[in-house]
Amino acid sequence: LTCLGGFASPGPVPPSTALRELIEELVNITQNQKAPLCNGSMVWSINLTAGMYCAALESLINVSGCSAIEKTQRMLSGFCPHKVSAGQFSSLHVRDTKIEVAQFVKDLLLHLKKLFREGQFN
């Protein structure tokens, strides 16, 4: 029964798998982009690498009504230890510096690929 229970509940996803899935989702977004992503919405830029997942989520959470990034928002929330809601402003953001969502997603993909290569999964 113990063994069967293990099959029934797969347990938490390893961080390396979660990061790879997030990277794959960002690749999908960047490759399948035809019209301007999220109608060219702008998000806060980020100026540090530490605490990046929460900061990235805080930027993207302010983009509403954009189905293309909803999965990314959900996935990022799994990496961020605290609850993030729209309107939050992290010290990691560059004040008064906004960039297009499409560029932000592309930059996030670059950064996550580096983390994956370096084995930094959390």
């Epitope: 830029s45 980020i46 100026n47 540090l48 690498t49 960039i99 297009e100 560029q103 932000f104 592309k106 930059d107 996030l108 670059l110 950064h111 690929k113 580096k114």
Partner: nanobody, 118 residues
């Protein structure tokens, strides 16, 4: 869109110093390895120095080692190149650029001219 704007070039005497700056906008500067490249009159493009995204590692061409120092301020989205003990052969247009292995992430500035002459 993405912009890289160099400044600080000019005319300087041999043995003199200059500090180049590159103001970045339109992308997440803190996540990119960055560098300075140069092109001397009638010559090809040469990488001078590269700095990793966090600033933790730096690389220099042999021709500038010990004379040039690359640095960055991610809070200001700015890249710097401190050039000391300048020589006539350092005369070139200096370009600020992203330095990622994947050319999908390739961005370049317009360049700033450095002339070393007496």
């Amino acid at each position: 869109g993405v912009q890289l704007l160099e400044s600080g070039g000019g005319l300087v005497q041999p043995g003199g110093s200059l500090r180049l700056s590159c103001a970045a906008s339109g992308f997440t500067f803190a996540w990119y390895d960055m560098g300075w490249a140069r092109q001397a009159p009638g010559k090809g493009l040469e990488w001078v120095s590269i700095i990793t995204d966090t600033g933790g590692r730096t690389y220099y061409a042999d021709s500038v080692k010990g004379r040039f120092t690359i640095s960055r301020d991610n809070s200001k989205n700015t890249l710097y190149l401190q050039m000391n003990s300048l020589r006539a052969e350092d005369t070139a247009v200096y370009y600020c650029a992203t330095a990622e292995r994947d050319d999908t992430f390739d961005y370049w500035g317009q360049g700033t001219l450095v002339t070393v002459s007496s």
